[in-house]
């Protein structure tokens, strides 16, 4: 096992240079020190080491820093960032936007979405603020990444990001995530009016509380039944017939086609029959 072998005399390097290319894998494992690599990451990136050799270097760094890399090293990772996993990144403590931006440049076009998300999340967790460059770098990543952030991290996402979210980006988000994102979206779109507001907020409605839905009913949104079906059952069942009538507007008749399915069935079950009768749709509670 390579782990057991001792470094041959005279083979212990003082610097990272081309000679290391010719070391056998077990020699790299036995002779190269993690702190040496950490201090000379620029050379590690410059010299054309094989993927296997770089993997050994990563193993050495991981052993040297079992609690996660220090920010001084993270800042210097350069292209070596590609060999770092999201799990590794979650152990880091990144506080500088420069560090984040440096690594985001490295990751550009490299299919490293998971690493980028983990990096931004760890930066946010440390209380970092998203500057324009970071937000721009996130532009290229499908916004489903929002569901990967912890609820705490989500709070740190600027509301401006909400403008970029598409219809199915949040399909995998938990209820808690959606609740936070709905509030962010409300704040992002507060100066948008009428139909445009509803088009924007529609994506986030799975996070709307009962109170939010009641408030939404005050704005002539004419919600279609497909959107209605995505609402939280808990939020929906407490709405009155009048509120649902106002929410759906001209689409109120579509309740009939969905009356046997959740969440419409759950909502009907909670209403008084005389109130349902007032809709004239033949709905049964």
């Amino acid at each position: 096992d390579t782990e057991q072998k001792a470094c041959p005399p005279g083979k212990e390097p003082n610097v990272v240079d081309e000679n290391l290319i010719f070391y056998q894998n077990w020699e790299l494992e036995a002779c190269v020190d993690g702190t040496l690599l950490a201090g000379q990451m620029d050379l590690v990136n410059e010299i054309p080491f094989t993927y296997e050799q770089l993997s050994i270097f990563k193993h050495k760094l991981d052993k040297t820093y079992p609690q996660g890399y220090p920010e001084s090293l993270i800042k210097q990772l350069g292209h070596f960032f590609r060999y770092v996993s999201p799990e590794d990144i979650r152990q880091w403590n990144v506080t500088s936007p420069d560090t984040v931006n440096t690594l985001l440049k490295v990751s550009k076009g490299q299919k490293m979405d998971a690493q980028v998300i983990a990096l931004v999340a760890c930066y946010l967790r440390g209380g970092g603020k998203l500057d324009e460059d970071i937000v721009k770098a996130l532009d290229n990543i499908p916004l489903s990444y929002l569901c990967d952030f912890s609820p705490q991290d989500l709070h740190a996402i600027p509301s401006s990001v909400m403008w970029l979210v598409g219809l199915h980006d949040l399909d995998k988000c938990s209820q808690r995530h959606l609740g936070i994102l709905y509030q962010k979206a409300c704040s992002a779109f507060q100066n948008v009016s009428g139909l445009e507001y509803f088009e924007k907020i529609r994506t986030f409605l799975g996070g709307a509380s009962r109170e939010d839905l009641r408030a939404l009913s005050q704005h002539n949104v004419s919600m279609d039944i497909a959107t209605f079906k995505k609402l939280q059952v808990d939020a929906l069942v407490g709405l009155s017939v009048a509120e649902v009538q106002k929410l759906l507007g001209p689409h109120i008749g579509d309740l009939k086609t969905e009356e046997d399915k959740s969440p419409v069935r759950d909502w009907l079950f909670r209403q008084q029959q005389k109130d349902l009768d007032s809709l004239g749709l033949g709905l049964q509670g």
Partner: antibody
Framework: EVQLVESGGGLVQPGGSLRLSCAAS????????MSWVRQAPGKGLEWVAT????????YYPDSVKGRFTISRDNSKNTLYLQMNSLRAEDTAVYYC??????????WGQGTLVTVSS | DIQMTQSPSSLSASVGDRVTITCRAS??????LNWYQQKPGKAPKLLIY???RLHSGVPSRFSGSGSGTDFTLTISSLQPEDFATYYC?????????FGQGTKVEIK
Amino acid sequence: EVQLVESGGGLVQPGGSLRLSCAASGFTFSDYFMSWVRQAPGKGLEWVATISNGGTYTYYPDSVKGRFTISRDNSKNTLYLQMNSLRAEDTAVYYCARFDGYIFDYWGQGTLVTVSS
Amino acid sequence: DIQMTQSPSSLSASVGDRVTITCRASQDISNYLNWYQQKPGKAPKLLIYYTSRLHSGVPSRFSGSGSGTDFTLTISSLQPEDFATYYCQQGNTLPYTFGQGTKVEIK
């Protein structure tokens, strides 16, 4: 039985302030939006303010925006209307009303506010 | 804001008469039209909501119709307790607005 009882009306000078209260009973107060509607002497009805069931959202017409503040205390089943910078044209009977979607379905008996020097 | 115009402003009628009050909205309000009854010195009471639905406890002699901008409240056979002022209110668009009222008096 739904009951709404307003209080706090009275005579106030122009520019002055007044706080109206409305005690609610007979329904789950925290489940409903609530509103204030006023009626000047011998005139029609005018909607003044609405607040969401949890107090997060508030709505006002332009005539009172920035001067009146609607609030609620769900633990006390009470609705409030804080009226500042009062004008002669704010003289009216102020009614507290339960609001359901687009309907003022139950009303209190009203409290008279007179703004005069 | 949506203007609500009621006509007539007042009318005189006898017990047993059929009474019709109209309400016109300055723009389409779909069916979000409610009617209230108010007696002197009392609070308004909801009679009809969503154009034609009777609120609980309201007698069936009251009925409502219309859609869009033109609405009607009909009392099929006027009773002594129906002498009051009637208001329409649109619930389609904020700010919610009321008509100026129609006073139904004894002839």
